[in-house]
């Protein structure tokens, strides 16, 4: 709020802009007939220092010269970088109550001369872009600093642009607004940046470049692909490019991939044939361009073209398995199962499967198509049967896979030995076995089959299986394996026309069951008690149950209970015990045991055996 210096003037020596570390003299002079009205000798001039509008110092003690009542000179030192405001005020000492009156003020800027600009870098984006250069300005000057970018080319042609840096904006890039045409490819250009402020000037070293050094082609555009004769593996990639491009780089990958296929194409003229694509696969394609084989810069990658290659007929063979169930004396139900082809084998959307069941002597053939991965038929129990399945998409069908239908567990001599199941981790079970001891025909393959031991699993859920070569005696099963669930695992040994199997239960992780079995009845028959129970609900078993335990003790007794341990069998739900005294009341209960421990006890039942009738 300085009133335009009516009372006097303030001047600075050597200048209002000084280098860091320099001192300055500030003189405050009153105009004629200004000052304290009655006693000019009582005029006292004071100098106040403000930083960011905040009073920081009264420079009363820094007077170096004084013309009483007319002017005073103050020396200021140790000024910080940036701007500092000094205000001269008049203090009429005879009137203590009146505040000092502002006379005039001055701003002093402290800064440094600019350093020579460095690291000049110029670029022209595309053949029709303009040349823009950037540079490193060096240390902040704290003063308004002007930068001039000057470009010189052939025939003494010159072009320049200017900008400035201050405390609000930074100038380290300029667009010259000039475009270099490709016919200057061999020409050399020189660019330099000059910096000037009130404390000095400096100039960069000249930076020399050619057209090829700075022109970055625009990324290719309008990318498309044409599949030859609707082929899923061959396609012509096409795009638009700037006229001077001589080299392209193509990269492409399936969308779920993490590594690109890279191709360099010279003089492609916007067209390139690809021959190694995977049918029915989502691909991403990108292209980059360069104006010179050896020099110059690559363009940015183009926008992605995402497209799916066409289908081709399926390849590979289906993995088939089956289940046989006798219905009555002359009929059996055959359930065929197969695994979906993986995408690289399916090579398209599988529309249906062609299933054939054939009696080997060709008397009977059953054929059908299905969209499912299973098929069930009732056939006679007589005759030798074979099954085949093939997968079809819009372009054709895979070669059929054949399997002989044999009695899977019919030959004891083919049963694998010493089958074991060990939990590997939360979702794996390692199954091992020994080959059949006295097989009268060679084992062609082993099938490891598993399904959860839960009610209705045979009818509700298809089996899971793995095919194992005949020289392998182990399998790590992981598909659909969940912790705390018991699985029935069968190892089948198959020859050309026979099958043998062994069964075991296994889990990938176990805990003690949540509860014990529920005793439903206790009956007495011929001096033996029969304990009947219901099995623990499936979710509460928490793994494979190894044994049940039946506990009993005399009512009100504090003695340890007696117990009987029973090997777990799913089909068993009663057991006899015979060591109870007649006409003594007993309390009975049951628990279940997994590899992790014993469950809490189930319900308690009281029973008093009657013994022999008199």
């Amino acid at each position: 709020n300085i009133d335009v210096c009516k009372l006097g003037t303030v001047t600075v020596q050597p200048a209002p802009v000084i280098p860091l570390g320099s001192a300055a003299n500030i003189s405050c002079s009153l105009n004629p007939k200004q000052g304290c009205s009655h006693y000019p000798s009582s005029n006292e001039l004071i100098l106040l220092k403000f930083v960011n509008d905040v009073l920081v110092e009264n420079l009363h003690g820094k007077k170096v010269h004084d013309h009483t009542g007319h002017s005073s000179t103050f020396q200021v030192t140790n000024l910080s970088l940036g701007m500092t405001l000094f205000v001269c005020k008049l203090n009429c000492s005879n009137s203590q109550k009146k505040p000092p009156v502002p006379v005039c003020g001055v701003e002093i800027s402290v800064g440094v001369a600019p350093e020579p600009p460095q690291n000049i870098s110029c670029v022209q984006e595309g053949e029709n872009g303009t040349v823009a250069c950037s540079w490193n300005s060096g240390k902040v000057t704290y003063l308004k600093t002007n930068y001039t970018l000057q470009l010189s080319g052939p025939n003494n042609l010159t072009c320049q642009k200017q900008c400035f840096s201050d405390n609000r904006q930074n100038c380290n890039r300029l667009d010259l607004g000039i475009n270099l045409s490709p016919d200057l490819a061999e020409s050399r250009f020189i660019v330099r940046v000059t910096a000037i402020n009130d404390l000095g000037n400096s100039s960069s070293l000249p930076h020399t470049f050619t057209f090829l050094d700075i022109v970055i082609p625009l990324p290719p555009w309008d990318i498309r692909i044409n599949f030859l004769n609707a082929s899923g593996s061959r396609g012509t990639l096409q795009w638009e490019d700037e006229g001077q491009v001589v080299l392209n780089q193509l990269r492409y990958q399936p969308l779920n991939s993490t590594s690109w296929n890279m191709v360099n194409a010279t003089n492609a003229k916007g067209k390139y044939d690809l021959r190694d694509l995977r049918p029915f696969t989502e691909y991403e394609f990108q292209i980059s361009s360069k104006l010179h084989l050896s020099g110059g810069s690559w363009s940015n990658w183009s926008e992605s073209l995402r497209t799916r290659t066409p289908e081709e007929e399926p390849v590979g063979i289906l993995d088939i398995w089956y289940m046989k169930q006798d219905i009555d004396y002359d009929r059996q139900q055959i359930s065929l199962f197969w695994k979906s082809l993986n995408p690289s084998e399916a090579r398209g959307k599988i529309l249906h499967y062609q299933v054939t069941l054939q009696e080997v002597t060709k008397k009977t053939t059953l054929q059908n198509t299905t969209r499912h991965t299973s098929w069930t038929r009732v056939i006679p129990r007589t005759g030798a049967w074979t099954a085949s399945v093939s997968a079809a998409n819009s372009k054709g069908a895979s070669a059929p896979t054949h399997i002989n239908i044999v009695d899977l567990c019919g030959t004891g001599l083919l049963a694998p030995h010493q089958v074991s199941a060990k939990s590997e981790n939360m979702d794996n079970i390692l199954v091992t076995w020994q080959p059949p001891k006295k097989a009268d025909s060679a084992v062609r393959e082993y099938i490891v089959e598993w399904r959860a031991l839960q009610p209705g699993s045979i009818t509700k859920f298809p089996p899971h299986w793995l095919r194992i070569p005949p020289d392998n005696m182990s399998a790590l099963i992981s598909e659909n394996i969940k912790p705390y669930i018991c699985y029935e695992i069968r190892v089948h040994a198959l020859s050309e026309s026979q099958g043998g199997c062994s069964s075991i239960r296994g889990d990938s992780k176990h805990k003690a069951p949540v509860s014990g079995p529920h005793i439903t009845a206790i009956t007495e028959k011929k001096e033996r008690l029969f304990i009947s129970w219901t099995h623990i609900p499936f979710p509460e078993q928490r793994g494979c149950i190894l044994h049940y335990r039946i506990y009993w003790k005399e009512r009100d007794s504090t003695a340890q209970p007696e117990l009987c341990e029973i090997q777990y069998r799913r089909s068993q739900n009663s057991h006899p015990i015979s060591s109870l005294q007649p006409r003594v009341t007993y309390v009975l209960w049951m628990t279940a045991v997994t590899a992790a421990g014993e469950s809490p006890q189930g319900n308690e039942r009281e029973f008093c055996p009657q013994g022999k009738a008199n």
Epitope: N155, L157, T158, C159, Q160, K161, I178, N179, S181
Partner: nanobody, 127 residues
Framework: QVQLQESGGGVVQPGGSLRLSCAAS????????MGWFRQAPGKEREGVAA????????YYADSVKDRFTISKDTAKNTLYLQMNSLTPEDTGMYYC????????????????????WGQGTQVTVSS
């Protein structure tokens, strides 16, 4: 919108003089290349003289050096070409061009590089 308007052409005897003017509207002279071109019947347009207002550089074709002088009056936004010692070879349509935005190997002489053009003024040198 930028408009360039040439004037000052006419018929003159060999050895005579003419002063061409190019008045610019919608355009400021600061930091731009401006030039004079001519085109004789059946020939390509050729650069005669140019001035770079940003740095004060002045360029002349060899054929007119020491005879022609290019200058500008920033206050009047006008470009001039003073032509002395005219010869019949100087006959043609003279055009004013402004804003060299594309550099070709011909530099300031290449007419393809300029963004704005006037309609032209005819100069005929004949006895």
């Amino acid at each position: 919108q930028v408009q360039l308007q040439e004037s000052g052409g006419g018929v003159v005897q060999p050895g005579g003089s003419l002063r061409l003017s190019c008045a610019a509207s919608g355009y400021t002279f600061s930091n731009h290349h401006m030039g004079w071109f001519r085109q004789a019947p059946g020939k390509e347009r050729e650069g005669v003289a140019a001035i770079y207002t940003g740095a004060g550089n002045i360029y002349y074709a060899d054929s007119v050096k020491d005879r022609f002088t290019i200058s500008k009056d920033t206050a009047k936004n006008t470009l001039y070409l003073q032509m002395n010692s005219l010869t019949p070879e100087d006959t043609g349509m003279y055009y004013c061009a402004a804003d060299l935005t594309r550099w070709y190997s011909g530099g300031w002489r290449d007419p393809r590089g300029y963004k704005y053009w006037g309609q032209g003024t005819q100069v005929t040198v004949s006895s």
